[in-house]
């Protein structure tokens, strides 16, 4: 009796996977064994697939064989038993191109109020993802194990931390990553839970600013009790989207260790130019708090988003305000090279009633004032880019009276 | 599959000096804490410090802080624990452990151990 | 230093029997706790970590709870190789530290 080819062969690629799994053409033939041959693109020969020989299974696994993932490749199987079936060609196929990313890897760290998802490729240095292993990004679906009220969270890199959760409870999540580059969506990580911690007697930090002062830049945070210590750690912002790089680790700043302050002043020769990531513990020599949310700094905008220089033209109902370049130590003016916003706020100097202008211009009209009386202003710079969301600190207020009627043309 | 493997057993007389070495492999050697935990004869653990192999970092158990040097060789995956001024009290195991990532915004548990070498300090 | 507990100090008991051990440290640890089992000439093995998660490759059987200054390891039915002495171990701040260790003992 002639044997039958196998029919409907699939090839299944997933990271560094290859399997192959096919269906018997005819069940009543027993002890059939199968065989694969694989040809590249340009070749005429066909070659043994090893790992893929005398299969007794409908499925084999030819991840051994090195490939150029990003070049054709072409199968053929038959059925073999005394004699062998006819060859049945499989579509020619790119791995690159057919290729799922597997579940990553996933670690989780608890807080009381907030959990530390650690991300890495399932397939540690990958030949699938080698030249894309810095483009992943990952989402993750997160939810109550008590609930299960799923909430997603969108293009996250390799660390990623969720706040506002609530103390001693269980969240589920899972994670799965995506190559944009290649309009490729992994398969989900298995779920994995953890429970937060009960409640720290010791909240992080909150609030943290920097601002420059002369040569230094001062580091501010809140905190709620007293007589405590404090030390700042930081990190290049380029590495939370590569943990795997020996370089990411959190260092201490050596001016900010141990500090028994809300504040601490270092030099801004500590960084070179970039943008880095900051955070705060706090300790009152027992216990040790969680680390404050990370602030993103960077020193460009940082060492010059002073607050602006402004001079003010006195009319009976306006003021003309015109913003100048602010002043750095030595009075030379500071050269902007980046959009900004002004938040001009101004006042009758007998009240508190505060009044807000935001413009992109550096002329601005403030209007509908009284004759003859004193209002005060003050105002700050805000960089329009979102994602370095950074504000000067205001200006000192600036106080002016207004003429007397009639002098506004 | 990730081995910590441990130098030979050591005799040291009081006051001498012993240097212990953990030679790892199997995973990424720099990404890693590495720990050591001694035990003396029949009695429980205790932690000693910890290096971090791709800078030197390096922490200590107040208590042995003058005493202990944690050094290492990148070139061999190799972690080393020199103790001086030994004196008897010092007998026991010493062990090197890996510890957490170093990229963990926490500390971890120590997931892997040497076997182990007996160091004895007798005159 | 953050002390921690351990009880009992020894336990007998029979294969098949739940056991449990319970460790207790002076400050709030965060579930910064690891359980390890240690045989005699041997280094000692992880079982879990984190007070709650199972290393891989440890039987089920092993279960650790528990949270702020109170935790435990339940043996749910004891096995001959089970037989050994369990530490519990801190690492929520420097110097970490352990317990005395629990010796579990054929009755």
């Known amino acids: 009796k002639n044997l039958k080819s196998p029919q409907k062969v699939e090839v299944d690629i997933i990271d560094d996977n290859f399997i192959l799994r096919w269906n018997r053409s005819d069940e009543s033939v027993g002890n059939v064994t199968f065989s694969f041959d694989y040809q590249k693109t340009g070749m005429d020969n066909w070659i043994k697939l090893s790992g893929c020989q005398n299969i007794t299974s409908t499925k084999c696994n030819f991840s051994s064989l090195k490939l150029n993932v990003y070049e054709e490749i072409k199968l053929r199987i038959r059925a073999e038993k005394e004699n062998t079936s006819s060859w049945y060609e499989v579509d020619s196929f790119t791995p690159f191109r057919k290729a799922q990313i597997g579940p990553p890897e996933v670690h989780l760290e608890a807080e009381d109020k907030a959990i530390v998802i650690h991300i890495s490729p399932g397939t540690k240095d990958s030949v699938m993802w080698a030249l894309d292993g810095l483009s992943f990004t990952y989402s993750l679906v997160i939810w109550k194990n008590s609930s299960g009220v799923e909430e997603r969270i969108e293009n996250i890199y390799s660390r990623h931390k969720i706040y506002k959760l609530s103390p001693e409870t269980t969240y589920c999540l899972k994670v799965k990553a995506a190559l944009l580059t290649s309009w490729k969506i992994g398969v989900y990580s298995p779920v994995h839970c953890i429970k937060t911690t009960v409640e720290n007697e010791l909240p992080p930090p909150e609030n943290i600013e920097v601002s420059v002062q002369n040569q230094n830049y001062v580091l501010k945070w809140d905190y709620t009790y007293a007589n405590m210590t404090f030390q700042v750690q930081w990190l290049h912002a380029f590495l939370k989207r590569n943990p795997g790089n020996h370089l990411y680790k959190w260092k201490q700043i050596p001016d900010c260790e141990n500090v028994k302050t809300t504040q601490c002043v270092f030099p801004q020769n500590v960084f070179q130019k970039g943008i880095y990531l900051l955070r705060v513990q706090a300790s009152d020599g027992n216990n040790t708090s969680f680390w404050s949310e990370e602030i993103k700094f960077d020193t460009e905008i940082q060492a010059f988003l002073l607050p602006p220089v402004f001079n003010i033209r006195s009319l009976s109902d306006s003021f003309h305000i015109y913003i100048g370049a602010p002043k750095q130590s030595g009075n030379t003016p500071v050269i902007q090279d980046y959009p900004l916003i002004y938040e001009i706020i101004f006042w009758e100097n007998t009240s508190n009633a505060e009044r807000k202008i935001i413009e992109k211009k550096t002329d601005v009209t403030v209007p509908n004032l009284k004759p003859l009386t004193v209002y005060c202003v003050k105002a700050r710079a805000h960089t329009m880019d979102e994602k370095l969301n950074k504000s000067s600190v205001f200006s000192d207020a600036v106080c002016e009276k207004t003429k007397p009627g009639n002098t506004s043309k | 599959q990730v081995q910590l493997v441990q130098s030979g057993a050591e005799v040291k007389k009081p006051g001498a000096s012993v240097k212990v070495s953990c030679k790892a492999s199997g995973y990424t050697f720099t990404s890693y804490w590495m720990n050591w935990v001694r035990q003396a004869p029949g009695q429980g653990l205790e932690w000693m410090g910890k290096i971090d192999p791709s800078d030197s970092e390096t922490h200590f158990n107040q208590k042995f802080r003058d005493r202990v040097t944690l050094t290492v060789d990148k070139s061999t995956s190799t972690v080393y624990m020199e103790l001086s001024s030994l004196r008897s009290e010092d007998t026991a195991v010493y062990y090197c452990a890996r510890g957490g990532r170093i990229s963990f915004d926490y500390d971890a548990a120590l997931d892997y151990w040497g076997q182990g070498t007996l160091v004895t300090v007798s005159s | 230093d953050i002390q921690m507990t351990q009880s009992p100090s020894s336990l007998s008991a029979s294969v098949g029997d739940r056991v449990t051990i319970t460790c207790k440290s002076s400050?709030?640890?965060?579930?910064?706790l690891a359980w390890y089992q240690q045989k005699p000439g041997k280094a000692p093995k992880l079982l879990i970590y984190g007070a709650t998660s199972l290393e891989t490759g440890v039987p089920s059987r092993f279960s650790g709870s528990g949270s702020g200054k109170d935790y435990t390891l339940t043996i749910s039915s004891l096995q001959p190789e089970d037989f050994a002495t369990y530490y519990c171990q801190q690492y929520w701040n420097k110097p970490f530290t352990f317990g005395q260790g629990t010796k579990l003992e054929i009755k």
């Open positions: 400050e709030v640890i965060y579930n910064r």
